[in-house]
């Protein structure tokens, strides 16, 4: 309930906010949950706490884990959890689902794409913007404050947009990138029974105990703007929100429009520090619209350890 997912790339700055809010004068203590070790507040540290914010300058893959923040108010302490995952940089241009922020939709009249999480950082204009990893050039694109405006939006403007900016902390500069999908609303659309693209029904995914894993639930619902189109994960038939395990978190549903114009939605279930008991759960990807509900089930299995026995006698 009081947990939030945050993610970033290694060697970039990542700033995380405590999910519990309070007055600016309240003291906030941060801990690394697994060791209960206090996070220092001295800025000379690579990872340090600054009030409601936890700063990784820069982040490393080993920083991944659950962090506890305690907001100390006069009458009681409020505890929150920040579930942080730091990923290695992708060698190719493709940005995986688990690094994507929520999708925005645009039309000819309104085509603002906000740079996600930028308000947490100390940055100065201008922002750099990329579409499918290509730097945006031309008079149609205007970087304004923390958002991008596209003039005369067309359907082929849909795609993945990445903003890149520099965070400054005490004179040192750190790069930050964030990516989100942009879809273009199609006036002429239709709706149909949901088709789940992933996972396949009764699929089994191999995982390693102690590692992090992500499950993507992706479904298509027709073409153009949809009145109702939702995807979600369930655990053993229960909503994620009813399942009080901060290691397992579902992102908000994310719209995606593919080249064929289909309106598709996906959501990622993030499981941190996979445990034996996670293998016993049934993971249901649910896709729902006005036409009905479709369900695909996936289970987790333990990855067989590599046989390290010698091949010599």
């Amino acid at each position: 309930k009081f947990s939030k997912q945050s993610w970033g790339l290694e060697n970039e700055a990542l700033i995380v906010r405590c999910p519990r809010q309070g007055k600016s004068s309240y003291i906030v203590d941060w801990y690394y949950s697994q060791t209960n070790k206090s996070i220092p507040t001295q800025e000379r540290n690579r990872v340090f706490a600054s009030g409601q914010l936890l700063k990784f300058l820069p982040a490393e893959v080993a920083d991944s884990g659950i962090y506890t923040c305690i907001v100390r108010s006069p009458t009681f302490n409020r505890t929150g959890y920040a579930n942080v995952t730091i990923y290695k940089k992708q060698p190719d241009c493709n940005v995986p689902d688990y690094l994507m922020y929520s999708t925005v939709s645009g039309s000819e009249k309104n085509s603002k794409i906000y740079c996600p999480t930028i308000d947490l950082y100390n940055w100065t204009a201008p922002l750099e913007w990329f579409k499918n990893c290509q730097a945006l050039q031309g008079s149609r694109y205007k970087a304004h404050k923390s958002f991008l405006v596209i003039d005369n939006v067309m359907t082929d403007d849909a795609g993945d947009y990445t903003c890149k900016f520099i965070h400054n902390e005490n004179g040192a500069n750190y790069s930050v990138t964030a990516t989100r999908s942009f879809t273009v609303k199609d006036e002429q659309g239709f709706s149909r029974f949901p088709v789940i693209r992933a996972p396949a029904h009764n699929e089994t995914k191999e995982v390693e105990i102690g590692e992090n894993t992500n499950l993507t639930c992706s479904a298509c619902f027709g073409k153009g703007a949809q009145f109702l189109a939702t995807v979600q994960w369930q655990l053993n038939g229960n909503k994620i929100t009813d399942f009080s395990e901060p290691r397992i978190q579902q992102e908000e549903g994310q719209n995606q429009s593919f080249s064929n114009g289909l309106a598709c939605v996906n959501t990622v279930l993030r499981i941190a520090d996979v445990k034996e008991e996670d293998l016993l759960l049934r993971y249901d990807c649910l896709a729902l619209n006005l036409h009905g509900l479709r369900r695909h089930t996936i289970r987790l299995s333990r990855k067989n350890p590599i046989d390290h026995q010698s091949t010599y006698c």
């Epitope: 309930k1 809010q21 309070g22 100390r72 006069p74």
Partner: antibody
């Protein structure tokens, strides 16, 4: 500049439901909680509770549990107050106020009149 | 709940006079964790939302004239207007900003002679 813009006045009958909105602008919405304060005509101020705008968690004052619901639409930087099964004593001006050391920013208020 | 008691309920003063009003809380509003007193003062004019004047018992909100001063600690607090102006006609509320439920005093109505 920071602004909290509330929806317009409402005239309702007892037993009906009202939902009023408070749209924030000029700051990062999810950085600050939002409080709701009630002021009946000619009376003093009553704190109703607040909502955590980052995770959507509401906290209600003792006299405002049950018929009252706080909600939010993060993408629109908007919080909502819904009052169900309206009673005559719900007639009041309702203010949203941004959390902080003291409430430095207030909406203009929404007058809800409950009358048969 | 913390009860906030304001006195007097109303005051009538002339322009230029000094005025003080009192606010007492039923429990201490001092937080030992940071030595802050969580008390706020507001001014409310007819048909308007309250305006924050003072927070932390004595810190003046940005843009508030320096004729407004807050003082006190623990359970006893005072708002002083050093030289009342015509535009100060309003109701003044103190607020427990310390713990839930945040409670307001009954107000002091300032009238100009």
């Amino acid at each position: 500049q920071i602004q909290l813009a509330q929806s317009g006045p409402e005239l309702k009958k007892p037993g009906e439901t009202v939902k009023i909105s408070c749209k924030a602008s000029g700051y990062t919405f999810i950085n600050y909680g939002m409080n709701w304060v009630k002021q009946a005509p000619g009376k003093d101020l009553k704190w109703m509770g607040w909502i955590n705008t980052y995770i959507g968690e509401p906290t209600y004052g003792d006299n405002f549990k049950g018929r009252f619901a706080f909600s939010l639409e993060t993408s629109a930087s908007t919080v909502y107050l819904q009052i169900n099964n309206l009673k005559n004593e719900d007639t009041a001006t309702y203010f949203c106020a941004r959390e902080g050391d003291g409430f430095a920013y207030w909406g203009q208020g929404t007058l809800v009149t409950v009358s048969a | 709940d913390i009860v906030m008691t304001q006195s007097p309920p109303s005051l009538s003063v002339s322009v230029g006079e000094k005025v003080t009003m009192s606010c007492k809380s039923s429990q201490s509003l001092l937080y030992s964790g940071n030595q802050n007193n969580y008390l706020a003062w507001y001014q409310q004019k007819p048909g308007q939302p309250p305006k924050l004047l003072i927070y932390g018992a004595s810190t003046r909100e940005s843009g508030v004239p320096d004729r407004f001063t807050g003082s006190g600690s623990g359970t006893d607090f005072t708002l002083t207007i050093s030289s009342v102006q015509a535009e100060d006609l309003a109701v003044y509320y103190c607020q427990n900003d310390h713990s839930y439920p945040y409670t307001f005093g009954g107000g002091t109505k300032l009238e100009i002679k």
